[in-house]
């Protein structure tokens, strides 16, 4: 059976959209699926990896490589996404191109970056992890470590960082996907909200969605031990 | 507010080794992203990028230059030295400092300029 | 190193004309390229970023534009005020180079 809700919930846009919600209820009045993944039932993506998810997850890293910052020409905010996404007339796509980029390095100006940007996070404004020397952060936005502390000051004259950002990753289902969502919509959707995160490929879903012991690599499961749990 | 203020001698003899000093305030070179570096103008001409030093201790020099330049900074004292060596009359100008930034490496601030003459 | 070339040298306008400086690179420098404002006996002033970004406290009359090796700085509506030497930089590759100037003298 299902138990279906629907609600309007402020969505990517700024806008309040009608948004349903589909829980498959369990047959035996316990918990949810989730809860029982939670609690260490046999859910094979946690012991060992899954073909179906490591596509997705390579898919929406795909995506995410080409995304820029879309910022909201009325200073209402911006959110991370796709150039089709993003209104021609009401926004601006901040993505760098034709040289636009700045320097991978302050070593060598001449080399530029063309991933990016990514809304709140730049190599040029983020103090730790800084990105300099031996610690250069890869013209790969997918690559790019979260940034835990910014540099002091409270505008940069960056489009992508003086906006308000709308949208975090947020990891939805027991599939482990992740999208780029407000926190109304992520809360209401019971997924799991990462405010210190700007992209997708920062966060391990998977690894919240089994729980328990967490992963020794996040990239591959390995809760061998939930077949004597359950 | 961020202001430069650039020190040293009027006139220096060819041969001779020029000190400059950059004392600044509204900052702190210790800050991220932010450098100090000169720019020299000879009279009626175009300006000429000498040095920068950043708030981790990176230097770079013009090439055209490099020999004869070293730059270092007091990050206590706020401030920043540019020592020329040998001198000539075509080094005559008016020699600024001024605060940079990573966010472009553009010059944001600027010292009022301090006007060196070489002769003998 | 790259050579910034601007032009004219000097001009001579009328207050409230459109003036238009031009600033040409040796080489592709995407948009990393920076405008300069000289008032006589005075240092130099940042007025824009990236080409075209305005800085914060310059007059809205200052614009830039271009990409690639080809870039202007437009004034519109001149002031008494702007009476001035105009300096490009570009920040593309080290070391950083200006182009000559473009004084601006008001009739």
């Known amino acids: 059976a299902q138990h279906v809700t629907t609600q309007l919930v402020l969505r990517n846009k700024g806008v309040y959209e009608s948004v349903k919600y589909i829980q498959q209820e369990n047959f035996w009045i316990g918990p949810s699926s989730i809860d029982l993944i939670h609690l260490g039932a046999k859910f094979s993506p946690c012991i060992r990896k899954d073909q179906q998810i490591e596509q997705l997850v390579l898919r929406e890293r795909d995506l995410e490589r080409d995304s820029g910052c879309c910022v909201q020409n009325d200073h209402s905010g911006c959110i991370q996404t796709q150039r089709k996404d993003c209104s021609e007339t009401l926004a601006t796509f901040v993505k760098w191109q034709d040289d636009t980029g700045p320097p991978m390095d302050k070593s060598d100006l001449g080399q530029k970056r063309t991933s990016g940007a990514v809304c709140h996070q730049d190599p040029r404004t983020c103090e730790e992890p800084a990105s300099s020397g031996a610690h250069i952060w890869p013209d790969d936005i997918t690559k790019w470590p979260i940034c835990t502390e910014q540099a002091k000051s409270n505008r940069t004259g960056f489009l992508h960082m003086d906006c308000q950002i709308k949208g975090r990753p947020c990891c939805i289902s027991t599939k482990g996907s992740c999208e780029i969502t407000t926190r109304e919509y992520c809360e209401f959707m019971h997924g799991y909200f990462h405010e210190e995160a700007t992209l997708c490929s920062q966060v391990h879903c998977l690894d919240k969605v089994c729980g328990l012991l967490p992963f020794l690599n996040p990239e591959v499961p390995d809760q061998f031990y939930r077949l004597w749990l359950s | 507010q961020v202001t430069l203020r650039e020190s040293g001698p009027a006139l220096v003899k060819p041969t001779q080794t020029l000190t400059l000093t950059c004392t600044f305030s509204g900052f702190s070179l210790s800050t991220f992203a932010l450098g100090v570096g000169w720019i020299r103008q000879p009279p009626g001409k175009a300006l000429e990028w000498l040095a920068h030093i950043w708030w981790d201790e990176d230097k770079y020099y013009n090439p055209a230059l490099k020999s004869r330049l070293t730059i270092s900074k007091d990050t206590s004292k706020n401030q920043v030295v540019l020592t020329i060596t040998n001198m000539d009359p075509v080094d005559t100008a008016t020699y600024y400092c001024?605060?940079?930034?990573?966010?472009?490496?553009?010059?944001?601030?600027w010292g009022q300029g301090t006007l060196v003459t070489v002769s003998s | 190193e790259i050579v910034m070339t601007q032009s004219p040298d000097f001009q001579s306008v009328t207050p409230k004309e459109k003036v238009t400086i031009t600033c040409r690179a040796s080489q592709s420098i995407g948009n990393h390229l920076h405008w300069y404002q000289q008032k006589p006996d005075a240092s130099p002033k940042l007025l824009i970023k990236?080409?075209?970004q305005s800085i914060s406290g310059v007059p809205s009359r200052f614009s830039g534009s271009g990409s690639g090796t080809d870039f202007t700085l437009t004034i519109n509506s001149l002031e008494a005020e702007d009476a001035a030497t105009y300096f490009c930089q570009q920040s593309y590759q080290w070391p950083l180079t200006f182009g000559q100037g473009t004084k601006l003298e008001i009739k």
């Open positions: 001024a605060r940079i930034t990573t966010y472009y490496y553009g010059m944001d601030y």
């Open positions: 990236y080409a075209s």
